[in-house]
Interface confidence: low
């Protein structure tokens, strides 16, 4: 099953978010992921846990998965890189590199996205981006253009009650709120940007979508600068 | 240190079948691609396949499509080439080589070879 | 498929001199361009990666350049380990394709 979904939000601007990727397993929608560098594309570990024996291929230049469109273009992935704390039973450094099988071909279509490298809290209430093909509703309708919503990025006390995440949520991970406009178990792998800079991935962690008290949880890019520029160098 | 050593080579008829391993040590076989290059006596090295590091992407040169089969095994830290309706241009030192990680494709450490001769 | 244009397919030099080996590519490759030695009897071993990246261990007296879709290996210095067949290889685009070689003697 693909891992992602936006709930509570609206199909995005053809073609507005540039750095924004598909990555798929045998020709499938399974997960977001942003371009952080011509080669690069920025997702979360856990995606390939559903990936053993398929080909997984990256999508960019997308609006529409099925239609024809001038921008869109199927990569090969030649490399891929978990993060290597990663663990299947975690969130926590839940971040996966993958190398494209040669630079992706950029126009407007197709563009990096900057991501953030000072390691410090975006200021809650701050209301950032996320997209994704994920599912729209509880029926679980697949979209096939990219959806988006505008979420408050909520503090991490708040985040971390019992009544909410319960402490999970380390200083390596952010919070969004989550009251009927959410993201999901997917769109794991898609970017959170807040003023135009990447500062969160969608964890795939599962959890309740769409519940004010479940937060929807981001892993911070800040924190990983130095294994990001490792990887890329 | 880098090692990689292949095995599996030897005297096959046309249309008869082998499979290539490479045993690797010395470095994180996951984290890599690997390629499979062979040479005819005489000749210039010439790439066969390739599969990157955890085998989502393979490549054939066009002459071993359908013919050739290249896997990896990373927990036993070993790739394998499996060939079938073997033809006499076959015939080569097939070496396993490591796919550098510093952008598009080549071959940063080679192996010995085994050779591979097809003849009636 | 990407041809790879190399020459001169042989050439005899003197130790201490300078040589230049060219490839040609028939279409863009940016710096996708690796050079090779293969000493007599042995395997192909990297020498340059990314057009004029030195591999690990390699002297400093081997040197590669791109100008367009032609490439340079030059060997400064020569010595008598240097004798072997050089080839290039594009890593633009499957498949990869290797130069024809260049075969360096020593006079």
């Known amino acids: 099953p693909p891992r992602g979904r936006i709930l509570g939000g609206r199909e995005a601007e053809a073609h507005a978010r540039p750095y924004m990727a598909s990555v798929q397993l045998n020709g499938a929608h399974l997960c977001g992921g942003v371009l952080v560098a011509e080669q690069w594309v920025l997702s979360a570990a856990h995606c390939l846990e559903d990936a053993a024996d398929g080909k997984v291929q990256v999508l960019l230049g997308a609006h529409s998965l099925s239609q024809p469109e001038p921008s869109k273009r199927l990569y090969d992935v030649l490399r891929a890189v978990p993060h290597p704390d990663s663990q299947p039973d975690t969130i926590d450094h839940d971040l996966l590199l993958l190398q494209l099988s040669e630079k992706a071909t950029l126009g407007p279509a197709v563009r990096p996205l900057p991501w953030q490298r000072v390691d410090r809290d975006v200021a809650p209430g701050t209301l950032c981006d996320v997209a994704g093909w994920g599912i729209v509703n509880h029926a679980g309708r697949r979209p096939d253009s990219l959806q988006h919503v505008l979420l408050p990025v909520l503090d991490r006390a708040t985040c971390n009650r019992r009544t909410h995440h319960d402490g999970a949520i380390t200083e390596r991970l952010m919070c969004a709120e989550s009251n009927r406009r959410d993201s999901c178990k997917g769109d794991s792998g898609g970017p959170l940007v807040c003023g135009g800079v990447l500062e969160g991935v969608v964890t795939s962690g599962s959890r309740v979508c769409g519940n004010r008290k479940k937060p929807g949880i981001y892993t911070r890019v800040a924190s990983y600068a130095a294994w990001i520029d490792s990887v890329l160098a | 240190e880098v090692k990689l050593v292949e095995s599996g080579g030897g005297l096959v008829q046309p249309g008869g079948s082998l499979k290539l391993s490479c045993a690797t040590s010395g470095f994180t076989f996951s984290d890599y691609g690997m390629a499979w290059v062979r040479q005819a006596p005489g000749k210039g090295p010439e790439w066969v396949a390739f599969?990157?590091?955890?085998?989502?992407?393979?490549y054939y040169v066009d002459i071993v499509m359908g013919r050739f089969t290249i896997s990896r095994e990373n927990a036993k830290n070993t790739l394998y080439l499996e060939m079938s309706s073997l033809r006499s241009e076959d015939t080569a030192m097939y070496y396993c080589?490591?796919?550098?990680?510093?952008?598009?494709?080549?071959?940063?450490?080679w192996g010995q070879g085994t050779s591979v001769t097809v003849s009636s | 498929d990407i041809q790879m244009n190399q020459s001169p397919s042989s050439l005899s030099a003197s130790l201490g001199d300078t040589i230049t080996i060219t490839c040609h590519a028939s279409?863009?490759?940016?710096?996708?361009l690796s050079w090779y030695q293969q000493k007599p009897g042995n395997i192909p071993e990297l020498l340059i990666y990314?057009?004029?990246n030195l591999h690990t261990g390699v002297p400093s007296r081997f040197s590669g350049n791109r100008s367009g879709t032609s490439f340079t290996l030059t060997i400064s210095s020569l010595q008598p380990e240097d004798i072997g067949t050089y080839f290039c290889?594009?890593?633009?685009?499957?498949?990869?394709?290797f130069g024809a070689g260049t075969k360096l003697e020593i006079k």
């Open positions: 599969i990157s590091n955890l085998a989502y992407s393979f």
């Open positions: 990314k057009a004029s």
């Open positions: 279409q863009n490759i940016n710096v996708w």
């Open positions: 080589a490591r796919v550098g990680l510093y952008g598009n494709f080549f071959m940063d450490y």
């Open positions: 290889q594009q890593g633009q685009s499957y498949p990869l394709t």
